[in-house]
């Protein structure tokens, strides 16, 4: 059956032979209605990429550099399955390109000019493409030929396989730049030996090189890693201090109509029958005909790449930056130490309009990027399409797991002028009911619930975390009879109460009328039994403070809070009747942009923050008539974090633990991708 066939692309006679053997052996173990293999032979990996894009083939396995080519338009391919190395219990699908130095040296990443460098080889990922790509814009002009620019940047190097006649400085530390193990400084171990012997000041290798060459921890402690933020870390901390994370070997397919489920079904069956130590007659990860045919011989198996993970996320911002710099050879005109405009990520249409107004008032220091969901915004910040946004604590957690860092906190209670330097304790997550109802925390089953959005702190993580520990399952849509929790599956009972309008029904953005704090409260007013919101929501939307038709006549005393002990209290008593304390919303950014974002925002709030008194005729950053656009409307200022500059430190151990527990109930495709 053609639609059940995976057309594998082979790039040599030997690969084609192995592919035919793969096809025949799969036929013998799979049912006739299962997936099948067909083989397509092409002259090169690039031809395979084009063939898949043109629907003449379906799959091929590629190295990282080629995954980048596959992702570029017009190919638009995406990673669908990753080879893994190491054990099934601790599968490695990536390696980290690192810059290793001796501990007793005293320079940082931005001080490499004039140092001596050790490389694995010319044109190799960890040893050349990544470090030179990331340093590209610091190289002296003209940057072409690249070898000459690099020779003029470092004071001496060993770059195996470079042309020692044309670029003698690249071979200064290893005369002749031998391109094999005859050169003692060749490849990973060689580049590390070049550093160890004192020939070079820095070695560009993979994270595992140090461990493979120095079994003794005391010896490893004589070395450190250079981080991109111009700090150093121990060699064990490579996950937090690397030049780029590089995928090892990856199966790619079309982004649309790519048969990814079928490819996974095929490869999953293949590894069961013909994986490591499974079969004598055919082996997926070796071949008598040659090395690394179709798949790497060193692979131990396959893992399915999460569906939310596109090529940009898979390759990572640093890797793409490095390769793009090398390929396109373009550098920003502004010096790299000068802050470029900050691209704010706006959620849907209403936030985009406010962001546009901010952009005009900032004279272009702020630019705007849009996405339909918070997770899409986080992904855009990760891949460099946007730079920053302010997030609820639940999304600060997801952003943190995806490598972003908190930059500034929204403060709600501290008056100026101390606001900017004050660390607030957070706000209260509360459960609000109508005073006329007889509901308590203990009899919510079967009632109608209203939530700010799935994954948010007061509206979801805190109440559902508490509920989970009571009911011990994740079927919250069965616990409540119906509700509105924007971001739930469209057919879920937790979308039933949402108001839309139609195409935006239950979407986690302002197009859904019951989204956010004000939306969840409106849902309670109009349809629900309980709303999970922040403690300020009721006072902010009653007593005429919200002029919208649905809210203008509401009275504060018509609503009460549910306490965890089964009692109820006035909305004026959140300190004695709340579900938990929630961390304030915070601005997040990529590490490389954090300082610029902080500097610019502190400057912007001085002009457009809460010191502006007349918001009817001036732009106000923290105002949007109860809609909480870009920032919460009750923000007094954005405050410095001081040492709370990681998501764990910012959110606090207790909250991180609560959200981690709730992860077994997670419906976050982004979180799944970021923890792959």
């Amino acid at each position: 059956v053609p639609e059940k066939s995976v057309r594998w692309c082979a790039v040599s006679e030997h690969e084609a032979t192995k592919c035919q053997s793969f096809r025949d052996h799969m036929k013998s173990v799979l049912p006739s209605n299962g997936p099948s293999v067909a083989c397509v032979k092409k002259a090169s990996h690039l031809d395979c990429i084009r063939a898949i894009a043109a629907n003449e083939a379906d799959a091929v396995t590629l190295d990282a550099g080629l995954v980048y080519d596959a992702y570029l338009a017009p190919n638009n391919l995406k990673p669908v399955v990753a080879e893994f190395y190491g054990s099934k219990e601790d599968p490695q699908t990536f390696y980290y390109a690192v810059a290793v130095v001796k501990k007793d040296s005293d320079f940082q990443m931005n001080q490499l000019r004039g140092r001596k460098s050790c490389h694995t080889g010319l044109g190799r990922s960890a040893g050349w493409n990544i470090p030179i790509g990331l340093l590209y814009c610091d190289l002296p002009e003209p940057r072409k030929p690249l070898e000459k620019a690099v020779a003029n940047f470092f004071s001496g190097s060993c770059v195996p396989c470079a042309d020692g006649t044309d670029f003698p400085q690249l071979c200064q530390l290893c005369p002749g730049c031998g391109c094999s193990t005859l050169n003692q400084y060749f490849s990973y171990s060689g580049a590390f030996k070049c550093l160890k012997d004192g020939a070079g000041d820095v070695a560009f290798v993979k994270h595992s090189t140090i461990f493979e060459n120095l079994a003794n921890k005391a010896d490893r402690d004589q070395y450190e890693l250079l981080c991109l933020d111009n700090t150093r870390k121990s060699v064990d901390e490579y996950k937090d201090c690397h030049l780029a994370r590089v995928p090892s070997h990856t199966v790619v397919a079309r982004s649309v109509g790519g048969k990814e489920d079928l490819i996974w079904e095929l490869l999953n069956q293949a590894q069961e029958h013909f994986g490591k130590d499974k079969s004598k007659e055919f082996q997926l990860f070796s071949s008598p005909h040659g090395k690394d045919l179709l798949f790497k011989d060193s692979a131990h198996g396959f893992l399915k790449v999460p569906p939310r993970m596109d090529a940009k996320m898979y390759l990572g911002y640093e890797y793409i930056t490095a390769i793009r710099n090398l390929r396109e050879g373009t550098c920003p005109e502004a010096p790299t130490d000068e802050c470029k405009p900050v691209k704010w990520c706006a959620l849907s249409h209403h936030e985009r309009l406010k962001c546009d107004e901010w952009s005009v008032n900032s004279a272009g220091k702020i630019e705007c990027e849009s996405a339909e969901t918070t997770e899409d915004c986080i992904a855009k910040i990760m891949n460099g399409e946007a730079d920053a946004m302010s997030l609820d604590g639940g999304f600060v957690y997801i952003a943190g797991m995806c490598g972003l860092v908190p930059v500034l906190a929204e403060n709600y209670n501290t008056p100026n002028p101390n606001c900017e330097n004050t660390a607030e304790e957070g706000y209260f997550a509360v459960a609000v009911v109508k005073s006329s109802s007889d509901l308590t925390w203990d009899n919510l089953k079967g009632k109608k619930s209203c939530h700010t959005a799935v994954g948010r702190t007061a509206g979801w993580n805190i109440p559902m975390g508490l509920l989970y520990s009571k009911i011990n399952h994740c079927r919250f849509d069965e616990f409540f009879s119906e509700g509105c929790a924007p971001g739930s599956e469209k057919n879920s009972s937790l979308c039933k109460l949402c108001m839309g309008p139609s195409p935006n029904l239950c979407e986690p953005n302002n197009k859904e009328g019951y989204y956010g704090y004000t939306g969840a409260f409106r849902c309670l007013v109009e349809k629900g039994d309980v709303a999970f919101v922040k403690h300020q929501t009721v006072p902010q939307n009653t007593g005429g403070k919200n002029p919208d038709a649905w809210a203008k006549n509401l009275k504060e005393e018509d609503y009460e809070l549910l306490c965890l002990d089964g009692s109820r209290k006035s909305v004026q008593e959140p300190a004695n009747c709340h579900l938990a304390r929630a961390p304030n919303h915070a601005v997040v950014a990529r590490k490389d942009k954090a300082d610029c974002v902080q500097t610019l925002l502190l400057d912007q709030q001085r002009m457009f923050g809460s010191s502006v008194t007349d918001c009817s005729s001036n732009f106000c950053l923290f105002e949007s008539k109860t809609k909480d656009l870009l920032f919460r409307d009750d923000t007094v200022c954005l405050a410095k974090l001081h040492d709370r500059n990681t998501y764990e430190k910012y959110l606090g151990e207790e909250y991180v633990k609560a959200v981690t527990n709730l992860r077994k109930c997670s419906t976050s495709p982004l979180l799944e991708a970021c923890t792959f």
Partner: nanobody
Framework: QVQLVESGGGLVQPGGSLRLSCAAS????????MGWYRQAPGKQRELVAG???????NYANSVKGRFTISRDNAKNTVYLQMNSLKPEDTAVYYC???????????WGQGTQVTVSS
């Protein structure tokens, strides 16, 4: 809500010029920021240029150096002078004010600009 009426669009050859006007009924003097947006078929509406009451302006990268936004508070009007027009400038152009703080989704009829030889 201030009512806004756009005019001045038309058909123009590449390299030509047009001047769009946006007249407000009611006072725009109290309105801080005004913006010109455009929407080409099948594309998202995008900010082309904006101006604050104090005269701070901002332009989309694609129109910098070719378009100029200005406002006449006495006449309650905002203008967009478009020079060196290109085929990719073809779109319906809308004017908006940000006065409501609701960041509404209410737009006028717009004015069609077509750049074609």
């Amino acid at each position: 809500q201030v009512q806004l009426v756009e005019s001045g669009g038309g058909l123009v050859q590449p390299g030509g010029s047009l001047r769009l006007s946006c007249a407000a009924s009611g006072s725009i003097f109290s309105i801080n920021t005004m913006g010109w947006y455009r929407q080409a078929p099948g594309k998202q509406r995008e900010l082309v240029a904006g101006i604050t009451r104090g005269g701070t302006t901002n332009y989309a990268n694609s129109v910098k150096g070719r378009f100029t936004i200005s406002r006449d508070n006495a006449k309650n009007t905002v203008y967009l002078q478009m020079n060196s027009l290109k085929p990719e400038d073809t779109a319906v152009y809308y004017c908006t004010d940000y006065s409501s703080r609701y960041y509404h989704d209410y737009w006028g009829q717009g004015t069609q600009v077509t750049v074609s030889s």
